[in-house]
């Protein structure tokens, strides 16, 4: 058993059928000595009394809020939540596998650029008496700090019969170098609660390998004279680090008719500029990617040719 | 990338062509270990990541971007110069700045160039004779050394008594070829600012 | 004591269908995973497929995936193997088990697909 | 389609020392628990190992499971008449867990 915070203990169980549990001792805070009883969450039963209650937590039933009085009035709280191990392995219950880009991916993080700064987001099919609390830092056995933000609900989906909630959270490493060569990852905790169930995720990873730059943007079409072909121009993104010819990018041009079989032409640049021939109906779309480090590209940025 | 790919401008300085050509015989290398060394921790969340310049080179401070000198994260540690401006030492007149940036490129080249070389000798030892070392990708360390026209003594290629072991010179491998891809990639950052300088 | 008891194994042509249960009891059976593993005679134990404590996710081999279909009744204390488009290859004796460090298995029921 | 690769048989005589291995790989056993199971001729399998190396009580303590990187190992210290039987090593992999990984099973015969 440990402290999860003040008066919330995780109770680690090996869980299958007919499982022993683990005995629990529950001591009430407070310097009076008798006359004390305990009850547990909402139900007046009795369940033992005097400051200590020893109890074997095996299943749900045996988690809950812990409370022990004197005369009518309340003295302490002991919070139970139970974390489940399946043989061997701690479950994971409460968020979706997302299975991208690997299965068993709870958590997925993405940085526009290299200052330090990501998001993080999960999915789950749970809509209430859920919480989560973030933490992060660089490295774990001399951890460097990493400041997250609070988690919140930043989209919800239909799903066939099932609605999926995602939730999201902004961390920022404390002091970046946006050129630096990271050789320690960065470890990201969540920790979810549902109603009494604890479980924990983690991910890890270099920010190098989580760059997903924002699309170009000012996207526009220059005509060319006499010609079917069209000059496009845009600019790097404005969250897109800096100086730009440090920290250089290089662009994909799509020229897309408006069937999706028809055949896409593509060109690879490292200019902010191509020329390309405008299909009638067509559009033409360019996202970018970090020159050097071939992590994510952008998404599409789009105009239409006419 | 397999498509068409518009070419850089013909008069840009020598360096920055050597650069990119680095960096993708490190990166095609890189694949190739992965690849043929499937059975081995070689992925970037299994391996160690060491780097062999540490506490011998400073390229990533000496060859700071003027722009993130205000960056206060990116002056920890070591007496750190800035680029001003440059390019390559053979073009041009180079400041004292620049110099220290590229000599410390040049360090680790060596260094790279020195381990490389000590590991393919062992790999060619290997009686299940399972990976090389890519001829062209120290090739290309060579032609990036020679285009940075500095002159340090030779450091000598260590040999070594013992018998080899296999397995973990090929983990070791791994290690190396990760952190000297992240290198290549501070080199080619730096060979465009240059170029943009 | 834990227990489970399963039904539902028989001959059965090529191309027909077959549902096996298994009925859990002196445990929750609510709280736990649940898996079905086969053995082929003289062969060794193969994965079939699990479903989660609560339905919610099922995991199948590819050797049955789209044709086998893992399912639970929390209410009645059973798990079901739903079996389609059967083909020789499926004939074993067919076991339920729980997921857990310590594990419970059934008694196995004997399903022979021929013609 | 076996993952896990174990000897089709070992013998032994009465009171030896035998060992049956479970060869894997760095994404099941490698990162992953083993158990394993002792089946009789028909009857469902029963565990003698979970953990890699623990044993449920019930289980006599001749037999005893280890774990060095990617491989496990079973031992029947003192080998019986009664051990005579099909024993499998289960693990999971990383990426396809809770699906079982089995391995390919060896019968154990004791001579004599």
């Known amino acids: 058993i440990w402290e999860l915070k003040k008066d919330v203990y995780v109770v680690e169980l090996d869980w299958y059928p007919d499982a022993p549990g683990e005995m629990v001792v529950l001591t009430c805070d407070t310097p009076e000595e008798d006359g004390i009883t305990w009850t547990l969450d909402q139900s007046s039963e009795v369940l033992g009394s005097g400051k200590t209650l020893t109890i074997q937590v095996k299943e749900f039933g045996d988690a809950g809020q812990y409370t022990c009085h004197k005369g009518g009035e309340v003295l302490s709280h002991s919070l139970l939540l139970l974390h489940k191990k399946e043989d061997g392995i701690w479950s994971t219950d409460i968020l979706k596998d997302q299975k991208e880009p690997k299965n068993k991916t709870f958590l997925r993080c993405e940085a526009k650029n290299y200052s330090g700064r990501f998001t993080c987001w999960w999915l789950t099919t749970i809509s209430t008496d859920l919480t989560f609390s973030v933490k992060s830092s660089r490295g774990s056995s001399d951890p460097q700090g990493v400041t997250c933000g609070a988690a919140t609900l930043s989209a919800e989906r239909v799903r066939g019969d099932n609605k999926e909630y995602e939730y999201s959270v902004e961390c920022q490493e404390d002091s970046a170098c946006p050129a630096a060569e990271e050789s320690l990852p960065i470890e990201v905790m969540v920790d979810a609660v549902h109603k009494l169930k604890y479980e924990n995720y983690t991910s890890s990873f270099f920010i190098r390998d989580i760059i997903k730059p924002d699309p170009p943007k000012n996207l526009q079409l220059k005509p060319l004279k006499n010609s079917r072909q069209v000059e496009v121009s845009w600019e790097y993104p404005d969250t897109w680090s800096t100086p730009h010819s440090y920290f250089s990018l290089t662009f994909c041009v799509q020229v897309q008719g408006k069937s999706k079989r028809e055949k896409k032409d593509r060109v690879f640049t490292d200019k902010t500029s191509a020329t390309v021939i405008c299909r009638k109906n067509a559009s033409i779309s360019v996202r970018a990617q970090d020159r050097y480090y071939s992590s994510s590209w952008s998404e599409w940025a789009s105009v239409p040719c006419s | 990338r397999n498509l068409p790919v518009a070419t850089p401008d013909p008069g840009m300085f020598p360096c920055l062509h050597h650069s990119q050509n680095l960096l993708r015989a490190v990166s095609n290398m890189l694949q190739k270990a992965r690849q043929t060394l499937e059975f081995y921790p070689c992925t970037s969340e299994e391996i160690d990541h060491e780097d062999i310049t540490k506490d011998k080179t400073s390229t990533v401070e000496a060859c700071l971007p003027l722009e993130l000198t205000k960056n206060e994260s990116c002056l920890n540690s070591r007496e750190t110069s800035f680029i001003t401006n440059g390019s390559c030492l053979a073009s041009r007149k180079t400041s004292f700045m620049m110099a220290l940036c590229l000599s410390s490129i040049y360090e680790d080249l060596k260094m790279y160039q020195v381990e490389f070389k000590t590991m393919n000798a062992k790999l060619l030892m290997d009686p299940k004779r399972q990976i090389f070392l890519d001829q062209n990708m120290l090739a290309v360390i060579d032609e990036l050394m020679q285009a940075l026209n500095f002159n340090s003594e030779t450091v000598p290629q260590k040999s070594s008594l013992e018998e080899p072991d296999f397995y973990k010179t090929k983990i070791k491998l791994c290690i190396l070829l990760h952190a000297f891809r992240i290198r290549a990639v501070t080199i080619d950052r730096v060979m465009s600012y240059l170029n943009a300088s | 004591q834990v227990q489970l008891v399963q039904s539902g194994g028989g001959v059965v042509q090529p191309g027909r269908s077959l549902r096996l249960s298994c009925a859990a009891s002196?445990?929750?059976?609510?709280?736990?995973?649940m898996h079905w593993v086969r053995q082929a005679p003289g062969k060794g134990l193969e994965w079939v497929a699990f479903i989660r404590y609560d339905g919610s996710n099922k995991y199948y081999a590819d050797s049955v995936k789209g044709r086998f279909t893992i399912s639970r009744d929390n209410s009645k204390n059973t798990l079901y193997l739903q079996m389609k488009s059967l083909r020789a290859e499926d004939t074993a004796v067919y076991y339920c088990?729980?997921?857990?460090?310590?594990?419970?298995w059934g008694q196995g029921t004997m399903v022979t697909v021929s013609s | 389609s076996y993952v896990l690769t174990q000897p089709p048989s070992v013998s032994g005589t009465p009171g030896q020392r035998v060992t049956i291995s479970c060869s894997g790989g760095r994404s099941n056993i490698g990162s992953k628990t083993v158990k394993w199971y002792q089946q009789l001729p028909g009857t469902a399998p029963k565990l003698l190992i979970y953990?890699?190396?623990q044993r449920p009580s019930g289980v006599p303590d001749r037999f005893s499971g280890s774990k060095s990187g990617t491989s496990a190992s079973l031992a029947i210290t003192g080998v019986q008449a009664e051990d005579e039987a099909d024993y499998y090593c289960?693990?999971?992999?990383?990426?396809?867990?809770?699906?079982?990984?089995f391995g390919t099973g060896t019968k154990v015969t004791v001579l004599g």
């Open positions: 953990g890699n190396d």
């Open positions: 088990k729980t997921h857990g460090s310590h594990d419970n």
């Open positions: 002196g445990f929750t059976f609510s709280s736990y995973g």
């Open positions: 289960q693990s999971y992999d990383r990426g396809t867990h809770p699906a079982l990984l």
